[in-house]
């Protein structure tokens, strides 16, 4: 865990950052420069050397561990994303299959995320319908597993390979939204050429009992006309603006180093005309192909 890594002192970390800046500069003896900077800094602190830490004896403060655990376990404390993409379930015709206390719900999503965006988080939101006798106070205890249906390659067309994306136990007393983290899958989908992806939701009884009236039933609402249609939400960051800024900086540096380039009349601050338009065109193509399904 990042908090446990206390062996490198903050000063050394900062020095290593300086290393990145200076190491590529010609004519600078970086080690000498680093040593002299270090000596000067230590002199101001009235120290002869960087104090050593015995990592075995150093325990992080309790509040730091709590903070780490909060961010490690609380998915809602995600870094801010500046783009939100939502995709509705496109499989409007398949019905859930049920046998031996297991119910299977097929879902289909047409997902398209430009390659220059970084996917921060992705979640599948499912509305769970708890159906039980109102006289019975107990809730419904179920295991939900989200599978990705992988494309079959080669001869075995009939076989379906499935990959578990996420699973969890749900104890429900009321119908409500449940959220499942599918970030890794979406990052894979972004890299793949394909835009159509099939998921399957499995709901099984926790205690191997077949569902009956007394134990109640848990279902996923997949009705197309319903406000509770399964939703895939992708939180992403547009890195193109960062990339543009880096390119601008690189341009400025190269202009500094090679003044003769200025004569070419290059405008380092003009952005390429096409990316946004191309993305929009691509989106429109996707729209054309999926709108028919929607209608």
């Amino acid at each position: 865990s990042p908090i446990m890594n206390l062996e490198q002192s903050p000063l050394e970390e900062d020095m290593s950052l300086f290393g990145d800046v200076f190491s590529e500069q010609d004519g600078v003896d970086f080690n000498t420069l680093l040593q002299s900077m270090k000596d000067e800094f230590l002199k101001t602190l009235n120290l002869s050397d960087i104090p050593t830490q015995d990592s075995a004896k150093v325990d992080p403060p309790e509040y730091m561990l709590e903070l780490y655990n909060k961010f490690a376990t609380d998915r809602t404390s995600m870094p801010s994303a500046n783009i939100i993409r939502s995709f509705k379930n496109e499989d409007l015709f398949s019905q859930p299959v049920s046998f031996n206390g297991l119910r299977k719900y097929p879902l289909l999503f047409n997902v398209s995320i430009p390659h220059h965006e970084e996917v921060i988080m992705a979640e599948l939101r499912l509305y769970t319908l708890v159906q039980r006798d109102r006289m019975i106070y107990d809730g419904v205890d179920r295991k939900i597993t989200i599978f990705e249906v992988l494309e079959s390659k080669g001869d075995n067309e009939g076989e379906r390979n499935m990959l578990v994306l996420v699973s969890g136990e749900i104890y429900g007393t009321n119908s409500e939204w449940e959220t499942f983290d599918v970030t890794d899958a979406i990052r894979r989908w972004q890299k793949s050429g394909s835009s159509t992806h099939q998921l399957e939701v499995h709901i099984e009884s926790k205690h191997d009992e077949a569902e009956d009236a007394s134990s109640g039933r848990l279902e996923i609402d997949t009705s197309a006309q319903n406000k509770h249609n399964p939703l895939l939400i992708v939180f992403s960051d547009d890195q193109s603006s960062d990339k543009e800024r880096k390119e601008e900086l690189n341009e400025m540096i190269s202009h500094e180093q090679l003044p003769e380039l200025d004569n070419l009349g290059l405008d380092s601050f003009s952005s390429g005309p096409g990316e946004e338009a191309l993305l929009q065109m691509r989106s429109n193509i996707i729209y054309d192909s999926t709108a028919r399904i929607r209608r």
Partner: antibody
Framework: SLEESGGDLVKPGASLTLTCTAS?????????ICWVRQAPGKGLEWIAC????????TYYASWAKGRFTVSKTSSPTVTLQMTSLTAADTATYFC????????????????????WGPGTLVTVSS | DIVMTQTPASVEAAVGGTVTIKCQAS??????LAWYQQKSGQPPKLLIY???TLESGVPSRFKGSGSGTEFTLTISDLECADAATYYC??????????????FGGGTEVVVK
Amino acid sequence: SLEESGGDLVKPGASLTLTCTASGFSFSSSYWICWVRQAPGKGLEWIACIYAGSSDITYYASWAKGRFTVSKTSSPTVTLQMTSLTAADTATYFCARGRYYVDGYADYYPGDFNLWGPGTLVTVSS
Amino acid sequence: DIVMTQTPASVEAAVGGTVTIKCQASQSISSYLAWYQQKSGQPPKLLIYLASTLESGVPSRFKGSGSGTEFTLTISDLECADAATYYCQSYYYSSSSSYGSAFGGGTEVVVK
């Protein structure tokens, strides 16, 4: 950050242009700039949004169409032109950055407002 | 146009207590709802978007739930700093009716 300017005391029937200036980030295709107002002691009221990318897509509240015009001038500024002002337009006007939402069918639109300016006061009085 | 109705207009609770604010949309807006906190003389601050997603840096004491037309903001373990006015906002797009945004009337939270 965002900062509004141009707020003033004007007479009924007058026109006024407010400016929203962004600093610390440049306008890009991944968000919207929106205007929201708040009359003294009252709630928030959405006015309009403009896409910060290269195309000029705008959305207006139905009550604001015709009298209010949002436009991008030179980056990084967005203006809100207001005409035929009345006492009911007296309010603090905020500009806000709207998150960029896309639905699966390639329609994109402003979402929640995750960055706000401090506001500028417009007073309409004779 | 979508109309957002927020209740109650004002609520009072003790430090450490819990406050629940409700917001009702005049038509279904799926999960496209945000919650803001506004203190006197300041601009609003985003707390929650997409009905239940916590904005970066906002304490997990703030919890949003709901979808369609009924939404709830719950503030638990109330602190004095939570005294403010809270607003819900819908931001709904449909290819048939275009885009619209609307705020609720606000709920003043008083912390004793």
